[in-house]
Interface confidence: low
């Protein structure tokens, strides 16, 4: 297995609508035609898969229809957006990149992006 460097921002603050975006960049050592990107969430020493997408170089990422993630790719950069986040989803989001084809297979795991999510204050009731 060959290691590959993956870079991602250290900290991102989600918007008031629960949307967080960050760039995952990988230093491709080979000429991959198929890439798989997986977002993992680490919280309290538990690691869970948030979403994953496979794409052909030059094409768009394809996440499952019910995924909370969307993304676009440009060269060796993947722009990831995670939606529907709430305060309880605050945690370290790790970008994992795999060069699936052609071989040899490469695996790269970023150090993670700490995403902070703050639930918006509820609007006070108005009497009109």
């Amino acid at each position: 297995c060959k290691a590959m460097h993956v870079a991602q921002p250290a900290v991102v603050l989600a918007s008031s609508r629960g949307i967080a975006s960050f760039v995952c960049e990988y230093a491709s050592p080979g000429k991959a035609t198929e890439v798989r990107v997986t977002v993992l969430r680490q919280a309290d020493s538990q690691v869970t898969e948030v979403c994953a997408a496979t794409y052909m170089m030059g094409n768009e990422l394809t996440f499952l229809d019910d995924s909370i993630c969307t993304g676009t790719s440009s060269g060796n950069q993947v722009n990831l957006t995670i939606q529907g986040l709430r305060a309880m989803d605050t945690g370290l989001y790790i970008c994992k990149v795999e060069l699936m084809y052609p071989p040899p297979y490469y695996l790269g795991i970023g150090n993670g992006t700490q995403i902070y999510v703050i639930d918006p204050e509820p609007c006070p009731d108005s009497d009109f």
Epitope: C1, T54, E98, M100, P104, Y105, L107
Partner: nanobody, 126 residues
């Protein structure tokens, strides 16, 4: 500890068929991208085929395309290689492998590094 045990090899005549099996243990098999690689006598390691963790995508070396089929059964922690229309040049030691292993022997050759088992010998001869 991660373990991969291959079986199903043997002596077969040209044009014949074999089905290799690889039983995995010691790791979450269903999360792993699996491959078959082979090493012919006196030659380096050659990648043969790979399959996604969920079995949704498969890949083959040009030399085996249309003759070999890789598959997996995650419930049984097993990956298979169905080999049809075998040729003498398919004679080799076949290894089931995952590139993500943290334990076990490592096979490296020509830019490929895989973690795998002890292999199963396939000999194609008349």
């Amino acid at each position: 500890q991660m373990q991969l045990v291959e079986s199903g090899g043997g002596l077969v005549q040209p044009g014949g068929s074999l089905r290799l099996s690889c039983a995995a243990s010691g790791f979450t098999f269903s999360s792993y991208y699996m491959s078959w690689v082979r090493q012919a006598p006196g030659k380096g390691l050659e990648w043969v085929s790979s399959i996604y963790s969920d079995g949704s995508n498969t890949y083959y070396a040009d030399s085996v395309k249309g003759r070999f089929t890789i598959s997996r059964d995650n419930a049984k922690n097993t990956v298979y290689l169905q080999m049809n229309s075998l040729k003498s040049e398919d004679t080799a030691l076949y290894y089931c492998a995952t590139p993500r292993g943290a334990h076990g022997p490592t096979y490296c050759s020509g830019g490929y590094c895989y973690y795998g088992g002890q292999g199963t010998q396939v000999t194609v001869s008349s």
